[in-house]
Amino acid sequence: MAVTACQGLGFVVSLIGIAGIIAATCMDQWSTQDLYNNPVTAVFNYQGLWRSCVRESSGFTECRGYFTLLGLPAMLQAVRALMIVGIVLGAIGLLVSIFALKCIRIGSMEDSAKANMTLTSGIMFIVSGLCAIAGVSVFANMLVTNFWMSTANMYTGMGGMVQTVQTRYTFGAALFVGWVAGGLTLIGGVMMCIACRGLAPEETNYKAVSYHASGHSVAYKPGGFKASTGFGSNTKNKKIYDGGARTEDEVQSYPSKHDYV
């Protein structure tokens, strides 16, 4: 019961996380214009992974896509790639985990198969979450670097004719959505991996019982067989117990003419 709950909860948490990663990737507010000490108030700019938007003082908002690929920073391309990989892995993980759910019966699927699928989806969710967290963190680092560079340039005056950005950008809502979503996906993946351990059919643990017959020594073979000299009653190495170890009374040895050599 606990295993089913852990698996189900892991699935739901991962589902929410992946939905969040998709939402963050599509959002336009990855970076927002820092309004502090900015003399230009007629426009407010916010930017996403795919396009830039401007909200004018008139209330008019316009967005334009980054139509060039070569002109964009490599870091932005890396963030896009990380987010897309995260989404793809998460989506595959969700698909796999649906079939792995203990509460869903598909044909005569064995528990071992479900356990493997649960582990696979768990690992996929973990990698997906890490991709999202990494992508958002790389972007945040890029913003911080750009912010301080812009701040430095603001106070250098008009020395160089082509200055870098005077508009500074700060963290947008999408970054926080991405961090939380990545974390949820990661947690969901860990829960799936934990659930996998409970789903796996365990090997039957036999009680370690020492067997000894009266009058001669008998070895106990760990495989569940009684080793004999080959002349006794167990010449074919047949399993002498099933479903657990038997007591000494049940496994009785009778003396034979070969007992004493």
Partner: nanobody, 118 residues
């Protein structure tokens, strides 16, 4: 690369008028503003006026009511009509294009000198 060419600066008497123009050449990202900033000797850069790609206009506090900015999107040109000039308007006027592509980009002209004096 975007190139900005300014013209129209010069010496003018107080109360006089001047018209500055700035033409941008090259590929400019669609979301942007074009405008004018000025810097007097020993002073910080100051916003004069900007005109956005969406049609919004903003003026610096010290020039409101006296200066008029206009923009020709087809020619990628911005104009600054300065009237009722005062000696304190004396400065180097810089044309600026700020594009809102990824993390923004600034382009500046070489600057044109405006001197208001008797």
């Amino acid at each position: 690369e975007v190139q900005l060419v300014e013209s129209g600066g010069g010496l003018v008497q107080p109360g006089g008028s001047l018209r500055l123009s700035c033409a941008a050449s090259g590929s400019i990202f669609g979301l942007n503003f074009m405008g004018w900033w000025r810097q007097a000797p020993g002073s910080q850069r100051e916003l004069v006026a900007i005109a956005t790609s969406g049609g919004s206009i903003q003026y610096g506090d010290s020039v409101k009511g006296r200066f008029t900015i206009s923009r020709d999107n087809a020619k990628n040109t911005v104009y600054l009509q300065m009237a009722n000039l005062k000696p304190e308007d004396t400065a180097v006027y810089y044309c600026n294009v700020h594009t809102y592509d990824f993390l923004g980009r600034d382009y500046w002209g070489q600057g044109t000198q405006v001197t208001v004096s008797l």
